[in-house]
């Protein structure tokens, strides 16, 4: 029961996490600019992985996609790749984990197969979560670096003094969504891996005891009682008798007068 709960909870947590990773990847607020204070209006720029938007207090919003002419930094491409890999792995993991759920019966799927699928999906969720956390952290690091580099600098232009003030950008909502979502996916993956241990059938061989019936009885081939959930030849957990009460470790002997009760 605890295994089913752990597996189910891991699945739900991972599902929420992956939904969050998708949301973060699509969001435009990865970085937000400090408000431009104008006596009449405030104009504000925020940027995502795919486009840049400008919004002003009047309600006007304009968004423009990034184009190759912008010479986009390799870092942005890396973040995009990490987030997409995270989504793809997470989606595959979700698909696998649906079939691995203990509460869902699909044909005659053995527990060993479910355990393997649970472990596979768990690993996929862990990698997916790590990809998202890495992607968001790389972007955040770029913002921190830019923040300290964005200082007012002056240079002389043609015809007079030309002042250029670089605007600072801070963490957008998408970064926090991404970190939380990545963390949830990671936790969900760990839970799936823990659940896998509980699902995995244990090969516990108990010392088999053979019984002798009366001397004229037919001796059956010794084969112990094997506690199993799918592994080994004795899948139906039948007790196998060979007559007398001797263990398999002992040398087989013929019935004697002491065998009669």
């Amino acid at each position: 029961m605890a295994v089913t709960a752990c597996q189910g909870l891991g699945f739900v947590v991972s599902l929420i996490g992956i939904a969050g990773i998708i949301a973060a990847t699509c969001m435009d607020q990865w970085s937000t600019q400090d408000l431009y204070n104008n006596p009449v209006t405030a104009v504000f720029n925020y940027q995502g992985l795919w486009r840049s938007c400008v919004r002003e207090s009047s309600g006007f919003t304009e968004c423009r996609g990034y184009f190759t002419l912008l010479g986009l930094p390799a870092m942005l491409q890396a973040v995009r790749a990490l987030m997409i890999v995270g989504i793809v792995l997470g989606a595959i993991g979700l698909l696998v984990s649906i079939f691995a759920l203990k509460c869902i019966r699909i044909g005659s799927m053995e527990d060993s197969a479910k355990a393997n699928m649970t472990l596979t999906s768990g690993i996929m969720f862990i990698v997916s979560g790590l990809c998202a956390i890495a992607g968001v952290s790389v972007f955040a690091n770029m913002l921190v670096t830019n923040f300290w580099m964005s200082t007012a600098n002056m240079y002389t232009g043609m015809g007079g003094m030309v002042q250029t003030v670089q605007t600072r950008y801070t963490f957008g909502a998408a970064l926090f969504v991404g970190w939380v979502a990545g963390g949830l996916t990671l936790i969900g993956g760990v839970m799936m891996c823990i659940a896998c241990r509980g699902l995995a059938p244990e090969e516990t061989n108990y010392k088999a005891v053979s019984y002798h019936a009366s001397g004229h009885s037919v001796a059956y081939k010794p084969g112990g009682f094997k506690a199993s959930t799918g592994f080994g030849s004795n899948t139906k957990n039948k007790k196998i008798y060979d007559g007398g009460a001797r263990t398999e470790d002992e040398v087989q002997s013929y019935p004697s007068k002491h065998d009669y009760v």
Epitope: S31, Q33, Y36, N38, V40, T41, V43, N45, Q47, S52, V54, E56, S58, G59, F60, E62, R64, Y66, L69, L70, G71, L72, P73, L76, M142, L143, N146, V162, Q163, T164, V165, Q166, T167, Y169
Partner: nanobody, 120 residues
């Protein structure tokens, strides 16, 4: 990476009209705010007019009703039409723009300025 260039300045008679234009060039995503400022000899630089990307305009009290600011977002250009000019409007007119030019990269840029002289 971003350059502002003004044009249209010159000498004009009092009561006359003059048009200024300023074009932003370079790798530009958005020009959020474009505007005009002026600096008369021995005075501080002051606001003339600004216009946001959404079209919201702001004018200095001294030019309201006489000057008109407009912009072409597609060309990243701002215009200033000055009517009923007075000798008090004599100054160096500077173009200013708030430009987003890349990922988490934006800045406030100034043009080199263009001289406007109004003779009485």
């Amino acid at each position: 990476q971003v350059k502002l260039e003004e044009s249209g300045g010159g000498l004009v008679q009092a009561g006359g009209s003059l048009g200024l234009s300023c074009a932003a060039s370079g790798t530009i995503l958005h020009v959020m705010v474009m505007g005009w400022y002026r600096q008369a000899p021995g005075k501080q630089r002051e606001l003339v007019a600004t216009q946001t990307i959404g079209g919201t305009t702001n004018y200095a009290d001294s030019v309201k009703g006489r000057f008109t600011i407009s912009r072409d977002n597609a060309k990243n250009t701002v215009y200033l039409q000055m009517n009923t000019l007075t000798p008090g409007d004599t100054a160096v007119y500077y173009c200013n723009a708030d430009v987003v030019y890349g990922l988490a990269r934006s800045g406030n840029y100034w043009g080199p300025g263009t001289q406007v002289t109004v003779s009485s």
